[in-house]
């Protein structure tokens, strides 16, 4: 079953390579377990950036080596991606699955274009 997912169209990463955005889904029921996946689309290639499964009201748990962190509040997921560089500029798509209880729902956002600008190196001081 399909579900609507909303996310901002554009986000500019900070000078430290951190980008945050909210992924909001229109839950048709009372889900207790949710899976969130962030995918990056660039040059028609899609790669998985990170994924987390969480129980409603609890922290999102990403893998130890994940570049993502996040918190949830109701039907909103606040996602933060760190360690970004200019080459990571691309469309970051939020995918939400309501895993439990049945029925299963899947929603895919239109994507957030994240722009990353590498900071200029500081000039050497004499």
């Amino acid at each position: 079953k399909a579900m609507h997912v909303a996310q901002p169209a554009v986000v500019l990463a900070s000078s430290r390579g951190i980008a945050s955005f909210v992924c909001e889904y229109a839950s048709p029921g009372k889900a207790t377990e949710v899976r969130v996946t962030v995918l990056r689309q660039a040059d028609s290639q899609v790669t998985e950036v990170c994924a987390a499964t969480y129980m409603m009201g609890n922290e999102l748990t990403f893998l130890d080596d994940s570049i993502c962190t996040g918190t949830s509040s109701g039907n909103q997921v606040n996602l933060t991606i760190q360690g970004l560089r200019a080459m990571d500029t691309g469309l970051y798509i939020c995918k939400v699955e309501l895993m439990y209880p049945p029925p299963y729902y899947l929603g895919i956002g239109n994507g957030t274009q994240i722009y990353v600008i590498d900071p200029e190196p500081c000039p050497d001081s004499d």
Epitope: T37, Q41, V46, T47, E48, A51, L106, I108
Partner: nanobody, 119 residues
Framework: EVQLVESGGGLVQPGGSLRLSCAAS????????MGWFRQAPGKGQEFVSD????????YYADSVKGRFTISRDNAKNTLYLQMNSLRPEDTAVYYC????????????WGQGTLVTVSS
């Protein structure tokens, strides 16, 4: 056109085991993910398990964790679901599904195979 064909369903006693297979044909097997869903009579579609090829990560519904194991054999273009310690509440039609890119949703579905757990 990709086709998914499930097999391995049948009647089994509580506590018994079954292994479901899902053979993919007609296209590439390099899916982003493949999974198993089930639907019991009069109930909504339930996620059972899936495997994401990029990282080889597996996910399971709490109701089957520790009892079911998902795996795939790329050489045979086949996805498996090993089901142990079966319970009457596992009775359902089990469907195999495949996802091409991760942002397209579950693109392909099998026709389903019936699993009945009863004494």
């Amino acid at each position: 056109e990709v086709q998914l064909v499930e097999s391995g369903g049948g009647l089994v006693q509580p506590g018994g085991s079954l292994r479901l297979s899902c053979a993919a044909s007609g296209g590439t097997f390099s899916f982003y993910g493949m999974g198993w869903f089930r639907q019991a009579p009069g109930k909504g579609q339930e996620f059972v398990s899936d495997i994401r090829t990029s990282a080889g990560r597996t996910y399971y519904a709490d109701s089957v964790k520790g009892r079911f194991t998902i795996s795939r054999d790329n050489a045979k273009n086949t996805l498996y679901l090993q089901m142990n310690s079966l319970r009457p509440e596992d009775t359902a039609v089990y469907y195999c599904a495949a996802e091409m890119s991760g942002i397209s949703g579950w693109d392909y579905w099998g026709q389903g195979t019936l699993v009945t757990v009863s004494s």
